[in-house]
Amino acid sequence: LQDPCSNCPAGTFCDNNRNQICSPCPPNSFSSAGGQRTCDICRQCKGVFRTRKECSSTSNAECDCTPGFHCLGAGCSMCEQDCKQGQELTKKGCKDCCFGTFNDQKRGICRPWTNCSLDGKSVLVNGTKERDVVCGPSPADLSPGASSVTPPAPAREPGHSPQ
């Protein structure tokens, strides 16, 4: 015998108190599949969470984070604070990058500056807390009498520093 509840579509629930009639989900609740015996409570996006998509009778609300925070976890279950460029998030909050390291993002960790000398190059632009160093030509290319036809090597992109 077919379960009468299987005919109840998404957005309704099978109401045992009313002879298994399909009743619409009450306000602030939803059922995303058919044949449900209860509707689930809608997620509320409060505080640092803000509503990205309103709850409907067939789908839960979706949250994201207010400015200054970013989502973590499945379905944005957590909001982690952003830091400024030149900082990293530690267990004790945002802290400036130590000398010799940089972070050009609002999240992630401080990474060591590129060591130009490992590639036989010189430092063209010094690094900062926010930016990696820019490597220039090798010191030999800069010595007097050296040929000047060789163009300088392209700057290495941040993020390729040795770990």
Epitope: L89, T90, K92
Partner: nanobody, 124 residues
Framework: EVQLVESGGGVIQPGGSLRLSCEAS????????MSWVRQAPEKGLEWVSS????????YYADSVKGRFTISRDNSKNTLYLQMNSLRAEDTAGYHC?????????????????WGQGTSVTVSS
């Protein structure tokens, strides 16, 4: 697939105690440090406590020091947080988290996997 499943949350009166558990699967549990972090609705994520892979080093946020105790049972792949003398400001979703290496400290934020969390409400 790495999975962390928390349990033990609930509604408790100020001054009360709760013990949270986190069951881990999908990785070699004893090889990684673990943490608890919490998310209060009006605040960003806050680190609570960390424990090394072997369990011999533990660290706590100043706000919970002396009240909360982190521990682990590597034979059961389970992390615990014993919470005593609970206060209204401890109300939050508590998430178990896997760190990226065996060792840990109270500075480097090296978390790569989070559980979905268990809710703790401290209210009279």
């Amino acid at each position: 697939e790495v999975q962390l499943v928390e349990s033990g949350g609930g509604v408790i009166q100020p001054g009360g105690s709760l013990r949270l558990s986190c069951e881990a699967s999908g990785f070699t549990f004893s090889s990684y440090a673990m943490s608890w972090v919490r998310q209060a609705p009006e605040k960003g994520l806050e680190w609570v406590s960390s424990i090394s892979g072997s369990g011999d080093s533990t660290y706590y946020a100043d706000s919970v020091k002396g009240r909360f105790t982190i521990s682990r049972d590597n034979s059961k792949n389970t992390l615990y947080l014993q919470m005593n003398s609970l206060r209204a400001e401890d109300t939050a979703g508590y998430h178990c988290a896997k760190e990226g290496s065996n060792g840990t400290d109270d500075y480097h934020y090296d978390i790569d996997v989070w559980g979905q969390g268990t809710s703790v409400t401290v209210s009279s």
